[in-house]
């Protein structure tokens, strides 16, 4: 089941999935001046069996001017190596979801792809947040969001992360004004919501994560 909405937006923060659950779809988008080849795939799809998951379909872009030349998607070894450096390497990172069954790694780039990747997440997907450069993290809990199904509707949990400018004087995290939940009302008022304990991430996580994963052009 696809998640109805996109993950929550946190001011001055970006999010990143460490791996993608089976069923996730990625738009085949091309940069300006290029377009998908005729009869080319609209999406890549994370599929698999109990032991291995991978991306089905290939995205191919061709010049908008010359429609008969196709750009192949097969990544060069250097491209694959470069992309791997965008994963969290910190000892404080959560378990590597990409090594879990039922998850795909970040797909390698294809030639002339757009600068922004557009994913369609499925229930159970987890994304991690980090403050952008020049902002620091204040925490009340995990800097993550999970897409959950409740009463037939999907919702993303609210990440407990506030990003403050490094020059600003701010309250202690415990004194922060509570952020609104995704539906615009406190979670306590939403009686039918299921609360689960996701695995805890040390409060320093967002501050110590390798920034490279959030500064790639694929945000």
């Amino acid at each position: 089941e696809l998640c109805d909405d996109d993950p929550p937006e946190i001011p001055h923060a970006t999010f990143k999935a460490m791996a993608y659950k089976e069923g996730t779809m990625l738009n085949c988008e091309c940069k300006r001046g290029f377009r998908r080849i005729k009869s080319g795939s609209l999406y890549m799809l994370c599929t698999g069996n109990s032991s291995h998951s991978s991306w089905d379909n290939q995205c191919q872009c061709t010049s908008s001017a010359t429609r008969n030349t196709t750009k192949q998607v097969t990544p060069q070894p250097e491209e694959q190596k470069e992309r791997k450096t965008t994963e969290m390497q910190s000892p404080m990172q959560p378990v590597d979801q990409a090594s879990l069954p039922g998850h795909c790694r970040e797909p390698p780039p294809w030639e002339n792809e757009a600068t922004e990747r557009i994913y369609h997440f499925v229930v159970g997907q987890m994304v991690y947040y980090q403050c952008v450069q020049g902002y620091r993290a204040l925490h009340r809990g995990p800097a993550e969001s999970v897409c959950k199904m409740t009463h037939g509707k999907t919702r993303w949990t609210q990440p407990q992360l506030i990003c403050t400018g490094e020059m600003e004087t701010s309250q202690f995290p415990g004194e922060e004004k509570p952020q609104a939940s995704p539906e615009g009302r406190p979670e306590s008022e939403t009686s039918c919501l299921v609360t689960t304990t996701d695995f805890q991430i040390q409060t320093e996580m967002a501050a110590t994560m390798e920034t490279s994963i959030f500064t790639t052009e694929y945000q």
């Epitope: 696809l2 909405d5 996109d6 937006e9 779809m25 738009n27 085949c28 988008e29 091309c30 377009r35 998908r36 609209l42 999406y43 922004e116 557009i118 369609h120």
Partner: nanobody, 126 residues
Framework: EVQLVESGGGLVQAGGSLRLSCAAS????????MAWFRQAPGKEREFVAA????????RYASSVKGRFTISRDNAGNTGFLQMNSLRPEDTAVYYC???????????????????WGQGTQVTVSS
């Protein structure tokens, strides 16, 4: 010249229904993703629903899921938004949009649509 023209808006009582139409000219809908957005007074434009030309993905905002249905008649180059169980908070100007790529949804999705209509007003009274 590409044109998207919405129609079907109007004033309706809460709980009522409306069917919006989006007629396209200058492009063929059968190779474009079609979407609906809305903008209430004083608020940002928000995603409502989208459906790609191959019907692989249809997405709805959680606020309208189960009440609104997006559909398309590729032969007639027209898209539709069937709105049932309307609520006062559905009051807004509704815009039709189209793009060549796959479905884009959510709050960050205004820019990737290539073509936009002028909008049609929907007012739901309580």
């Amino acid at each position: 010249e590409v044109q998207l023209v919405e129609s079907g808006g109007g004033l309706v009582q809460a709980g009522g229904s409306l069917r919006l139409s989006c007629a396209a000219s200058g492009i063929t809908f059968n190779d474009h993703t079609m979407a609906w957005f809305r903008q209430a007074p004083g608020k940002e434009r928000e995603f409502v629903a989208a459906r790609d030309w191959s019907d692989i993905i249809t997405r709805y905002a959680s606020s309208v899921k189960g009440r609104f249905t997006i559909s398309r008649d590729n032969a007639g180059n027209t898209g539709f938004l069937q709105m049932n169980s309307l609520r006062p908070e559905d009051t807004a100007v509704y815009y039709c949009a189209a793009r060549e790529g796959g479905v884009v949804a959510g709050v960050r999705s205004g820019a990737p649509y290539d073509y936009w209509g002028q909008g049609t007003q929907v007012t739901v009274s309580s």
